[in-house]
């Protein structure tokens, strides 16, 4: 684009219009997680509300066992929260013994999988360590990105630990994506 | 939609068309707070910036006293980023002194209140326990999602502690919504 | 609106409509930094894959030196991620020590350069003390908000250590901006 | 506490307006949402209207909206209900209401009787 | 509008029956709320979104449904509950009730 003017951004309409009201949404709201047996160094995934208090889908956004389905290729916002709770991480002890103080971490990724690839996609990841004084702790890890996907992918929150979850309130941990 | 594809999109527009710049949008930016009196056991709510600098609010979103008020039906993005800053919080003098250690705690929620429901609803809640070592803390509470709302609903950010709320930048402290 | 109803929102169209598909939109991730010179007192800028793994631009929307370039006046959506990663702060040790404590911090800056205002304009900012006790301590810092943007403006993310961020995963450290 | 006071002409001659105000005590009334509703003789109740007093957004009963204006008074703390071109089936109570925060909150009434 | 149809008009139960009243809609609303009015006096909240108790609501009140039926119950009749009930719908323009469920001691 050097030396060059932009183009009139009304020659650039390359798309068929469509009504807002009409796209794929959906937000998803927690609710207790029963424990699922998930495979080593693989985090589990939460499973989520879709239809009562705040949480709902429209427009063909599906949600099922424990995934987003995505029925219409497109990019999408996409976006989560999770409220971690827990006793304090015994790093502090740790250090004071002298060992090697490795911290603990809470850790939340938007993962995508896809026909197209066999592995699935990280879209976005939120790491903390978490070495805390008090004895009880709590705090949210916060994700949101736009991404390309394509008809037919699953979308899905996986988290470190999801005893840590608080699972408490549907406004302290939700997952949601919308095209854009 | 199990064993069936996807239907396509262009039989899919059920609304109207609209154009994107007459959609309600609002970015509001922090300004120094005056003490309000607010009921007990209820967040005291943020007051905002809502036309200088980087603040706008366009398409009949409008802000009056604290609100956010929504002038037409649809699905809204909402954020918010609340910055706080304080002295350390006692916890580590407390738990050294072997009492038992409730940390302190600072927390953000975005409150919906609505004439169709005789209660204010909490959309978004990010709340983080505090318990620092050093002397002088300061970090961001960022919270953002999608919502159904109605004609007439009205947005406020409440906070746990309003004296802790950092107001010196208007790139610190904001809220925002936007029809998509 | 003193004493009337919202207007019908079908009366409100002034702007002409445009197909979603083709707006400006970019996804950018994190790549190793190499050391560039800075001005004392200024951020460093982060620099960025825009093509490979999640990373696109698209629409006009152009990546180049660090800045994406707006390519059409309008309301943008701008996010960014950012993990850090490092060794203790001292802060607990100062302050057994009984010196004076300024605790170490972490900032993210999303800034915007106009040829309108000679300043960068500073649009969000997120800061955060860090005082940890564990010895390796890891944390991300998001920011998202809307802003009016003008044809030509340019986006940078600027962090005040730019050796402590984590540049190892895509998913980790990340820069966003689409048009409303 | 929390307190909602009706208070206008208990008589009104048929097609005069009835005019009512309700004093808001208690709480900030922009928080919430101050609506209007009547109770006629040995009826229903019968929902007129409501004000968001934080931007003066109305809305109004289809079946009253031609004769009905809400107004409201944040100096005063009040809000204010105007029916035009009563006739004797206006003879109601007519209660003030807050909602939006609960408990939602009710004044005792006003008995407003149209007659000439 | 939405047509609130609340059965039955009036009832007669002994103390300690336990009284159930519905409430019907003309079409599905997400909320639905009940009043209590005794003689003389204003309405009172007794359930909000359809199955809330409003704060200092004896718990003997109860409310369930959802889309276009809805109930309201008081397990154990106490001669205080001498009222006319309503039921609510807050969603649609107007605001509408039911016309009231008269209850009586035997």
């Known amino acids: 684009l050097k030396g060059q003017e932009f183009a009139p951004s009304h020659q650039q309409v390359y798309a068929p219009l469509r009504a807002d009201g009409d796209k794929p949404r959906a937000h998803l709201t927690v609710v207790r997680q029963t424990p699922t047996q998930h495979f080593k160094n693989q985090f589990p995934a939460l499973h989520w509300e879709h239809e009562l208090g705040l949480a709902f889908t429209k427009n063909r956004m599906n949600y099922t066992n424990k995934f987003l389905l995505i029925p219409e290729s497109g990019d999408y916002f996409i976006y989560s929260q999770v409220t971690f709770r827990g006793m304090t991480s015994e790093c502090s002890e740790i250090r004071q013994a002298g060992r090697p103080n490795k911290p603990d971490s809470i850790t939340v990724v938007i993962t995508k999988v896809t026909d197209s690839y066999p592995e699935p996609t990280q879209l976005l990841m939120g790491t903390k360590s978490v070495c805390e004084v008090g004895s009880n702790w709590f705090q949210p890890i916060y994700l949101g990105a736009m991404f390309s996907l394509q008809e037919g992918d699953k979308l899905m929150v996986n988290v470190s630990d999801i005893s840590l979850v608080d699972y408490t309130k549907e406004d302290k941990t939700f997952f949601g994506a919308f095209l854009l | 939609l199990k064993g069936q594809e996807f239907a396509p999109s262009h039989q899919q527009v059920y609304a109207p068309l609209r154009a994107d710049g007459d959609k309600p949008r609002a970015h509001l930016t922090v300004v120094r707070q005056t003490p309000t009196q607010h009921f007990k056991n209820q967040f005291p709510a943020l007051h905002w910036e809502h036309e200088l600098g980087l603040a706008f609010t366009k398409n009949r979103m409008n802000y009056t006293n604290k609100f956010l008020l929504i002038p037409e039906s649809g699905d809204y993005f909402i954020y918010s980023q609340v910055t706080f800053r304080g002295m350390t919080s006692e916890c580590s003098e407390i738990r050294q002194a072997g009492r038992p250690n409730k940390p302190d705690s600072i927390t953000v929620v975005i409150t919906k209140v609505t004439d169709s429901y005789p209660e204010p609803t909490q959309l978004l809640m990010g709340t983080k326990s505090v318990c620092e070592v050093g002397s002088n803390w300061f970090q961001p509470i960022y919270l953002g999602a999608m919502f159904s709302l109605q004609e007439g609903d009205k947005l406020m950010v409440n906070v746990s502690d309003i004296s802790l709320v950092d107001y010196t930048k208007e790139d610190k402290t904001f809220f925002g919504a936007f029809l998509l | 609106l003193k004493g009337q109803e919202f207007a019908p929102s079908h009366q409100q169209v002034y702007a002409p409509l445009r197909a979603d598909g083709d707006k400006p939109r970019a996804h950018l991730t994190v790549v190793r930094q190499t050391p560039t010179q800075h001005f004392k007192n200024q951020f460093p800028a982060l620099h960025w894959e825009h093509e490979l793994g999640l990373a696109f631009t698209k629409n006009r929307m152009n990546y180049t030196n660090k800045f994406l370039l707006i390519p059409e006046s309008g309301d943008y959506f701008i996010y960014s991620q950012v993990t850090f990663r490092g060794m203790t702060s001292e802060c607990s040790e100062i302050r057994q020590a009984g010196r004076p404590n300024k605790p170490d911090s972490i900032t993210v800056v999303i800034t915007k350069v106009t040829d309108s205002y000679p300043e960068p304009t500073q649009l969000l900012m997120g800061t955060k003390s860090v005082c940890e006790v564990g010895s390796n301590w890891f944390q991300p810092i998001y920011l998202g908000a809307m802003f009016s943007l003008q044809e030509g403006d340019k986006l940078m993310v600027n962090v005040s250590d730019i050796s402590l961020v984590d540049y190892t995963k895509e998913d980790k450290t990340f820069f966003g901006a689409f048009l409303l | 506490q929390v307190q909602l006071q009706e208070s206008g002409p208990g008589l009104v001659r048929p097609s005069q307006t009835l005019s009512l105000t309700c004093t808001v005590s208690?709480?900030?009334?922009?928080?919430?949402?101050m609506h209007w509703v009547r109770q006629r003789p040995g009826r229903g109740l019968e929902w007129m209207g409501r004000i968001d007093p934080a931007s003066e957004h109305t809305k109004y009963n289809p079946s009253l909206k031609s004769r009905v204006t809400i107004t409201r008074d944040t100096s005063k703390n009040q809000v204010s209900l105007r029916l035009s071109s009563v006739t004797a089936a206006d003879t109601a109570v007519y209660y003030c209401?807050?909602?939006?925060?609960?408990?939602?909150?009710w004044g005792q009434g006003s008995l407003v009787t149209v007659s000439s | 509008d939405i047509q609130m149809t609340q059965s039955p008009s009036s009832l007669s139960a002994s103390v300690g029956d336990r009284v159930t009243i519905t409430c019907r809609a003309s079409?599905?609303?997400?909320?639905m709320y009940w009043y209590q009015q005794k003689p003389g006096k204003a309405p009172k909240l007794l359930i909000y979104?359809?199955?809330n108790l409003a704060s200092g609501v004896p718990s003997r009140f109860s409310g369930s449904g959802s889309g276009t039926d809805f109930t309201f119950t008081i397990s154990s009749l106490q001669p205080e509950d001498i009222a006319t009930y309503y039921c609510q719908q807050w969603e649609g323009n107007p605001r509408t009730f039911g016309q009231g469920t008269k209850v009586e001691i035997k």
């Open positions: 079409q599905g609303v997400r909320y």
């Open positions: 209401v807050r909602s939006g925060g609960l408990p939602d909150v």
């Open positions: 208690g709480f900030d009334f922009q928080d919430t949402y």
């Open positions: 979104g359809a199955s």
